[in-house]
């Protein structure tokens, strides 16, 4: 799903207050609900009729450093006989998410939000039929 | 997918540098890749064999203010005849994501990262069989 544009209003102080100095804001250390965990049924990526593989990207200057991307294994979906059926299609499910980018020059460290597009998994759909003129 | 614990090392300055004052850091205004957009096939939530509905939650002190959650419509999956087949199951695909929480007292505004669990969509799986003792 989409993350709307900031429009720079969310991070601004109220109009009656002095502006933020140097175009930066105060980010408190620590993460709210840090212990919250995904509780998905196990191994759904291989049990799905639209199975997928995972690729991990790693960047030490990003939080989280590890971002996992899914790739659908097939064009079609897997039928009851375990065969690929291309009358149906495996399609990626995408999500816009935020990460934090760390920028440092010596002891001066600052952070910036970054929008990342994550493919979370795949689902099996009826393809849309188009008649090309 | 999981976001690892901060371990409070990512947001710390190098050991040789003076510590961060008052437990806060500098967050630069603006979002990297802000114009990046999801490009999923249209209406996959209703064309899927494991269809889902969306619910929108809104919080003006969160960025993004709008968080969309998916709920699978059925326990089973929709077969070629358009009927629910519970020999297969619709299961949610979840993703841990970051949002920014705004906290203000008068003109003093600070921000904190918050972890949110988002159900992004659903996929059709073969259920795991358990024999209860």
């Amino acid at each position: 799903r989409k993350i709307p544009k900031v429009g720079h209003t969310f991070f601004q102080k109220p109009e009656s207050c002095p502006p933020v100095p140097g175009g930066s804001m105060k980010l408190d250390i620590g993460i709210i609900n840090e212990n919250q965990r995904v509780s998905m049924s196990r191994n759904i990526e291989s049990r799905s009729t639209s199975p997928w593989n995972y690729t991990v990207t790693w960047d030490p200057n990003r939080y989280p450093s590890e971002v996992v991307q899914a790739q659908c294994r097939n064009l079609g979906c897997i039928n009851a006989q375990g065969k690929e059926d291309i009358s149906m299609n495996s399609v990626p499910i995408q999500q816009e998410t935020l990460v934090v980018r760390r920028k440092h020059q010596g002891c001066s460290v600052s952070f910036q939000l970054e929008k990342v597009l994550v493919t979370v998994g795949c689902t099996c759909v009826t393809p849309v039929i188009h008649h090309v003129q | 997918r999981k976001i690892p614990k901060v371990g409070h090392t990512f947001f710390q300055k190098p050991e040789s540098c003076p510590p961060v004052p008052g437990g806060s850091m500098k967050l630069d205004i603006g979002i990297i890749n802000e114009n990046q957009r999801v490009s999923m096939s249209r209406n996959i939530e209703s064309r899927s064999t494991s269809p889902w509905n969306y619910t929108v939650t809104w919080d003006p002190n969160r960025y993004p203010s709008e968080v969309v959650q998916a709920q699978c419509r059925n326990l089973g999956c929709i077969n070629a005849q358009g009927k629910e087949d519970i020999s297969m199951n619709s299961v949610p695909i979840q993703q841990e994501t970051l949002v920014v929480r705004r906290k203000h007292q008068g003109c003093s505004v600070s921000f904190q990262l918050e972890k949110v669990l988002v159900t992004v969509g659903c996929t059709c799986v073969t259920p795991v069989i358990h024999h209860v003792q």
Epitope: - | C72, L75, G76, E84, V125, P127, H130, H131
Partner: nanobody, 115 residues
Framework: EVQLVESGGGLVQAGGSLRLSCAAS????????MGWYRAAPGKQRELVAI???????NYADSVKGRFTISRDSAKNAVYLQMNSLKPEDTAVYYC?????????WGQGTQVTVSS
């Protein structure tokens, strides 16, 4: 972890009635199905009756009009009222509980119908 508690089986004469019950605990989901399957000696396990999300029901043709499935969502329990029992209904009856991605089978309760 899911627990299933089955009860109500026993020995009954042909034409008699029994009521099976099964309560699930441990993991509760908005979407689920509960019901009963049975396995007669030397035969495959077959559907008796199930109820999906507390609403739609599905019965084996052989029990339609004689057996009634119902559930108490508050107790996460399912009941099978079996009337006009026949010797061919003799089997081990297994509670079935399906939550998204996982199916749980109970240990079974014996139903014996004597002629």
């Amino acid at each position: 972890e899911v627990q299933l508690v089955e009860s109500g089986g026993g020995l009954v004469q042909a034409g008699g009635s029994l009521r099976l019950s099964c309560a699930a605990s441990g993991v509760i989901f908005r979407l689920n199905a509960m019901g009963w399957y049975r396995a007669a000696p030397g035969k495959q396990r077959e559907l008796v009756a199930i109820i999906v999300n507390g609403g739609s029901t599905n019965y084996a043709d052989s029990v339609k009009g004689r057996f009634t499935i119902s559930r108490d969502s508050a107790k996460n329990a399912v009941y099978l009222q079996m009337n006009s029992l026949k010797p061919e209904d003799t089997a081990v009856y297994y509670c079935y509980y399906n939550i998204p991605g996982d199916v749980y089978w109970g240990q079974g309760t014996q139903v014996t119908v004597s002629s």
